[in-house]
Every structure is written in C-alpha cells, then in structure tokens.
Interface confidence: medium
C-alpha cells in the first residue's frame, strides 16, 4: 500500500484559530482503516472520515476546526496491511500566533524604597519575541528580548506593573502585577484569657492586618495593675496566636496587653485586658473529727479550720463524705463544724471524712473516722479501728 499525506508540505505553518484539514491518500488497498497519529499517540476523533476515490484509492481526512498551540506537533497516518502497520511520512504542524506568556509578573509586597525585580517571559512561534514594560500607563524603556527582568530601585506607594510581548503576529499583554508597600502591622484584637489557675493563665488573640509582611512574633506584657510595674514580658513565635503565662501569684489582679511584629517592626499595643488569678485551695484538714451516737442518729463534730494564708481567702462550707461497706455512700455540705448524719445503716461499719472548701476548691481530707457497727460512738483513727 502506498501512503502519503496530500496537500501538505513536510512542514505546515498555520495561524492560531485557523482550521486545518489533513488529507491522507491510500492507494493499493481496497478497504483501508486509516488511523491518525500525533506525536506517537493515536488521535481519538470522530472527525476522521474517508472518501473513496476509486476502488483502490482512498482519502482520509483529519479536521482540526481551530488550531491552538497544543495542536502543534508531528502528524502521520497509518494503516494495517496484512498484519503490518504502514505509516506515511510525517507533517510537522507549527501553530503561529501572538506571543504566549510562560512567566508573568507576580504581585509583590515590599518595604518603602526597597529594590525589587519583576520577571516576564513569552514565546512564539514566530520568534523573536520582545518585551516592553509598563509602569501604570507609562511605558518604561525600549523593547528587550524575552525573557526580561525589570529592576526597580524602589516605590513609595502601591504601583502597578505589566509587560507586553511583541512578535510578527501581534502583541499580547500580561496580567497586571500590583506592588504593594509593606507597613507596620495593626494591633491585635479579641484578646481572651482562658484556663485561669492560681499560677497560670492562657492567652489567645487574633492578629491585626499584617501590613503585607509575615508576622514573626508577638509580645505579651503583664503588669499587676494597668500602668504598674511590668511583671513579665513573653515573646512568642506565631502562629499560633496563643501564650501560656506561668509563675503568677495566686489571687492577684493583673493586666496584660499584646502587640505583634513583622519585618518592619512592631504594631501598637492592644488595650489592657484585666484578669485575676485564682486563690489557693485550703491547706489544712479539719482536726479532731469525732462522732456522737444519739437515739435519732449520729452527730459528727470537728474543729474549725483557721485560714493559714490570706491567699486562701475566706473559708467556706465543709464537705462531709461517708461510705459503708455495703456500697452506700454520700456527700453533704455543712456550714458549721457539726453535722447530723442520716440515711446510713447502723448495722454496718461507717467511714467518714471531712474537708473545708473555699472558692478554689476543697482542702485536704481529714483522717478518716471509722464508726463500728458495734460501737456506741466513734473517734478519729485509722480505718477499721474500733473506738469505745
């Protein structure tokens, strides 16, 4: 079989957007199945049609309606003949058009008066491609060969740049790159103090506008009163925008403020945020816990706990906890140093403990008191000890 591509030279140059119809002539075969191949891959296209010229002469068509750069390449047709594949000579399809940008100027953020570079590259065919730079609506300099790098000594306000690529087919304009000025960041906001304990506090905040320069760190300043002495200043890398303040004094009024910094410098401080650390839980356990059996039940008594340190604050109610070996247990809150216990089984041993609480929590438990089911009364002692 004789295969040849008709009506096409070895190199075919077409303008972008134009149609191309490749014709493949097959002679010496009665019923060829023509396949079109581009750069080694079979072209899947229902536009492949066949016209019989005579019994042993066929023409196959490959129609490309509107060529673009991706259609450029090496085309050939092939037929199966007696188990062997016969291929035609190839046609190199070149698609010409206005320049195509491979690199366009990117948006930048720079410090005032700092030098920077912008890049632009465009390709044909046809070559050569020349680049012209624009600053706003003003052309900068003359044409330069592609690729081109524009060196700018600095700007004092936001400025727009673009490039224009020229070849014999015309010109193409790139995207417009905006070069923004970097600035100091804005103050942080939404500052919240969470997870307060007697000596620690967690702080979180939202960063203000970064001034188009990456935020590098934030500073948390803590004082014991607004305008008072600085207690501590913590510099934290960001993100995340959080900080843990340690080694604070319990039950103390503090204020904190936050600022963040980028490469140009720090933001203003945000407003002061007051907070108070929690006090200490009571340090002492109630002493001399004892029981008095009465006809109506069981009365428990203990000595009043006196605050050891002012940081404990006022001592509040006492908490009484009792348990029996049958699994019964309960807790009750008592204002004074005396409690009347009900709802327990006198036939079972009873273990009682008491602690004093304040706003922070309960202090240590007292020594457990065991009230034996055989005893008339109980006293403080180790578990399961009998009292008379």
């Amino acid at each position: 079989a004789g295969l040849k591509l008709m009506g096409a030279p070895v190199k075919l140059t077409v303008s972008q957007g134009q149609p191309v119809k490749l014709n493949c002539s097959v002679e010496g075969m009665e019923e060829p199945d023509i396949q079109w191949v581009k750069d080694g891959a079979v072209v899947q296209n229902l536009d492949q049609l066949y016209i019989p010229v005579s019994e042993q002469h066929w023409i196959g068509f490959l129609s490309l309606k509107s060529v673009e750069r991706s259609d450029a390449g090496r085309y050939w047709c092939q037929v199966e003949d007696g188990g062997e594949t016969e291929i035609s000579q190839p046609v190199w399809l070149t698609v010409e058009g206005v320049p195509f940008f491979t690199v366009e100027p990117k948006d930048l953020a720079v410090p005032p008066n700092a030098p920077f570079q912008l890049s632009c590259e465009a390709v044909g065919p046809p070559e050569p491609v020349t680049i012209v730079w624009w600053r706003g609506t003003t052309k900068i300099g003359g044409p330069a060969p592609s690729p081109s790098v524009l060196n700018v000594t600095g700007v004092t306000q936001s400025t727009m740049f673009s490039c224009e690529a020229h070849n014999l087919k015309g010109l193409a304009s790139s995207r417009t790159a905006t070069v923004h000025l970097q600035a100091l960041p804005a103050a942080p906001f939404n500052i919240t103090v969470t997870k307060l304990s007697s000596s620690n506090a967690s702080v979180a905040w939202m960063p203000g506008a970064d001034g188009r320069a990456l935020l590098q760190s934030c500073t948390v300043q803590v004082t014991q009163a607004p305008g008072g002495w600085e207690v501590l200043a913590v510099v934290v890398p960001v993100p995340p925008f959080t900080c843990l303040l340690r080694d604070l004094v319990p039950a103390t009024n503090y204020s904190l403020r936050v600022r963040c910094a980028n490469a140009l410098g720090p933001s203003p401080y945000a407003d002061w945020v007051p907070f108070q650390t929690k006090g200490l839980a009571p340090a002492s356990a109630p002493q001399n816990l004892h029981a008095i059996r009465t006809d109506s039940g069981l009365i428990l008594e203990w000595e009043e706990v006196i605050p050891e340190a002012p940081l404990e604050g006022p001592l509040g109610p006492y908490k009484l906890s009792w348990v029996q070996d049958n699994g019964t247990q309960d807790e009750l809150t008592v204002e004074g140093t005396r409690a009347n216990l009900t709802g327990w089984d006198p036939q079972k041993d009873l273990i009682v403990r008491v602690c004093v609480s304040n706003a922070v929590g309960c202090g240590p438990w007292s020594q457990p008191l065991v009230v034996s089911s055989h005893d008339r009364a109980g006293q403080q002692g180790p578990p399961h000890s009998r009292t008379s």
Partner: antibody, heavy 125, light 108 residues
Framework: EVQLVQSGADVKKPGASLTISCQAS????????ISWVRQKPGKGLEWMGR????????YYGPSFQGHVTISADRSTATAYLQWRSLEASDTAMYYC??????????????????WGPGTLVTVSS | SYELTQPPSVSVSPGQTARITCSGD??????AYWYQQKSGQAPVLVIY???KRASGIPERFSGSSSGTMATLTISGAQVEDEADYYC???????????FGGGTKLTVL
Amino acid sequence: EVQLVQSGADVKKPGASLTISCQASGYTFTDYWISWVRQKPGKGLEWMGRISRHGSQTYYGPSFQGHVTISADRSTATAYLQWRSLEASDTAMYYCVRAGGQTSGGTIPEYYQHWGPGTLVTVSS
Amino acid sequence: SYELTQPPSVSVSPGQTARITCSGDALPKKYAYWYQQKSGQAPVLVIYEDHKRASGIPERFSGSSSGTMATLTISGAQVEDEADYYCYSISPAGNYGVFGGGTKLTVL
C-alpha cells in the same frame, strides 16, 4: 440511490434480549461508518454509538456503553444494534445513519446525510 | 458527560429571521452540525462544519460559530420551516457524538 432499510417495529418484555438491523444498499457498505441514534417518544435525539466500516472499531456514548452492542456483517451489508436485557426505558425509535457522505466535488465529508426510517422498540410488561 | 445546550423553543412570524443557538465548551475546537426534524419524519442534515449548507437546503439557512456558541440562522422563515432543530458535535476528546436537546421552531 443510498438506502438504509431497518427491521420492523418490535414489542418486548423487560429482561428480554433483542437485535434490530439496518441493511444498506445503493453504495459500498464498507466505504462508510454506521451510527445509531435513539429518540424516546416526544423527546430529542441521542447519539448511541458508531461502528467502523470493517467492524473493527466501535465508539459508544457514555449513557450506552455496556448496555448495547453495535456490530456489522460485511457480507450482507447490515449493521446491528443488540440488547442482552431490555428495560422499559429502552422504549424508543432507533435510527441507523450513514456517517459521512460526499458533496458533488467528492472530497468534502458530511455527517449523517442518510438516515434510515427508524425502528420502534416498545418494552412493556 | 459532555452536553450541548439549546433553547427549548423559538417563535417567529413568517418572513422574520429565526436564530437558534447551541452552546458547548468544546465548540471552539469541534465543528457544529444542524439537523431539521419534522413531525413523524427522520432528521435531515441542514448545516455541516459550522457554516456549510448541505445539498438541497435553501439559501435562507446559514450557520456560524464563535467561541462556545454555534448559531443556526433562518433568514425569512417560512411556515414549512416549522420543525425541531438539533445541533450535533463531538466530545472534547473526540470519542463520542452529542446532540443538543433540540429547539422547537414555531413560525406563526
């Protein structure tokens, strides 16, 4: 004169198999591809698929891939459309079409110039 | 799967110009074809390769294509032009054909 003669109307139950045919005359069968087009009652045209002149290549529309089989017999110049298991939604008119034609100049291809009269397939229980 | 979109109906008075559009993402690269189908008949090719008139089709039928839109224009529509019109093209990968949903042309 180019003619595409299609088999007669058919009524089938869901799950049944069916083959309809399209016999070409007035031209050399192996010169052109054959396509099948479906038209449900009161609805538009749907491209089902196409078979090459020799039966060596078939293309199917995404909705029909795996549901129908297109084949051809060169010796009788006949193209076929086959179902293994019909569904009620297959009720439609089915046209066979010659894909590709010639203008008076003899070199410009045209699509779907010659259509068969259609075969009405009804699938009902 | 690839779709071609047509308006369901277009109405014109006799002698007016009717325009039927067909939109599809691959139409910048793939040709559009137009078919006319009258009630109870098989379709007839009207336009091929965007703008070429098929043999036997009156000159008042013309086709054009721009970007993702193909248009069938009937200049001076006649009562006998009342029919369903379908655009046809092939998928972006070139491996299957697609018809538009069809447009019912009414010439009042």
